[in-house]
Amino acid sequence: SHTLPVHFLQPSDIQKIVEELQSLSKMLLKDVKEDKGVLVSQNYTLPCLTPDAQPPNIIHSPAIRAYLKTIRQLDNKSVIDEIIEHLDKLIFQDAPETNISVPTDTHECKRFILTISQQFSECMDLALKSLTSGAQQATT
């Protein structure tokens, strides 16, 4: 019988989830960048890779989810719904909530959205690189 502990998501699934997130992050960034004249800010930092970066906890999924949920509330980007669904595949059901302080100024909101979207896209590139290099090491 196949009753393995499903804590162990198959590596192929983790890879596919991260690939999907990478693709969706590019779509989000492209969408956000259509708002011209907005610059990235140094005031916001999206947590990215976990210290040990071990699958499935390769990225800070709960924190990333909270940031993206905040963007969804500030700006109705429907691609975020799909991003959240994929992040939920990597989030343990008892993971603590992350509180995000939201900027109130309209222009600052736009900077927040651009900055986090850009960092998210870069984070997914890093995560995929980390996964593929880890997979190569495992086969050598």
Epitope: D13, E85, D88, L90, I91, F92, Q93, D94, A95
Partner: antibody, heavy 122, light 107 residues
Framework: QVQLVQSGAEVKKPGSSVKVSCKAS????????MQWVRQAPGQGLEWMGA????????RYSQKFKGRVTITADKSTSTAYMELSSLRSEDTAVYYC???????????????WGQGTTVTVSS | AIQMTQSPSSLSASVGDRVTITCRAS??????LAWYQQKPGKVPKLLIY???TSASGVPSRFSGSRSGTDYTLTISSLQPEDVATYYC?????????FGGGTKVEIK
């Protein structure tokens, strides 16, 4: 053991609305997606939508968009599915379902409500 | 939306026969697939989740497998109590669509 108890059978007139409830007990998880599914007489299972009760986040089937509203009351651990502008084709058994497993996202629905029969007839 | 094509829509087999039901996803959904059994007038019951993990209390004659975007539910030795309709459902991204169902009868 998770238990889902749904509200009783309803008979409704075409054009009206119905609100079905689903009370969950016996679980501790906070991050989960609960789904609503319906089954017309002699037909297959049809996905209607889902809710993430911790945030009230919802997803709907394109077929029901604009007619269905899924909500949740965290204080009573109860989810609701409201379907408006009812027509005879909406006569069906409506189910809520709840997942088990370590992740927020489901990969199967382990627990199902007993079903609520909704009959739409003039 | 991801389509789930289930086949056959119905089958008739003898007690003790090996029965296979297939669901094909319209795109790669990884292992995010579940199988349910629904007996007439009853609530659906989860048999298999994450493509090949047996749900608690499910008899060992039921198993799930995957090859690419094709998913198979196998009943290794059909029993009279297995008369039911079987459904697959994917959980890759919403809408979490179901296959059309397979009605299993005893010859």
């Amino acid at each position: 053991q998770v238990q889902l108890v749904q509200s009783g059978a309803e008979v409704k007139k075409p054009g009206s609305s119905v609100k079905v409830s689903c009370k969950a007990s016996g679980y501790t998880r906070t991050r989960y997606w609960m789904q609503w599914v319906r089954q017309a007489p002699g037909q297959g299972l049809e996905w209607m939508g889902a809710i993430y009760p911790a945030e009230g986040d919802t997803r709907y089937s394109q077929k029901f968009k604009g007619r269905v509203t899924i909500t949740a009351d965290k204080s009573t651990s109860t989810a609701y599915m409201e379907l408006s502008s009812l027509r005879s084709e909406d006569t069906a058994v409506y189910y809520c379902a709840f997942p088990e497993g370590p992740y927020a996202a489901p990969y199967g629905m382990h627990y199902w409500g007993q079903g609520t029969t909704v009959t739409v007839s003039s | 939306a991801i389509q789930m094509t289930q086949s056959p829509s119905s089958l008739s087999a003898s007690v003790g026969d090996r029965v296979t039901i297939t669901c094909r996803a319209s795109r790669n959904i990884g292992n995010y697939l579940a199988w349910y059994q629904q007996k007439p007038g009853k609530v659906p019951k989860l048999l298999i989740y994450y493509a090949k993990t047996s749900a608690s209390g499910v008899p060992s004659r039921f198993s799930g497998s995957r090859s690419g975007t094709d998913y198979t539910l196998t009943i290794s030795s059909l029993q009279p109590e297995d008369v039911a309709t079987y459904y697959c459902q994917h959980f890759w991204s919403t809408p979490w669509t179901f296959g059309g169902g397979t009605k299993v009868e005893i010859k």
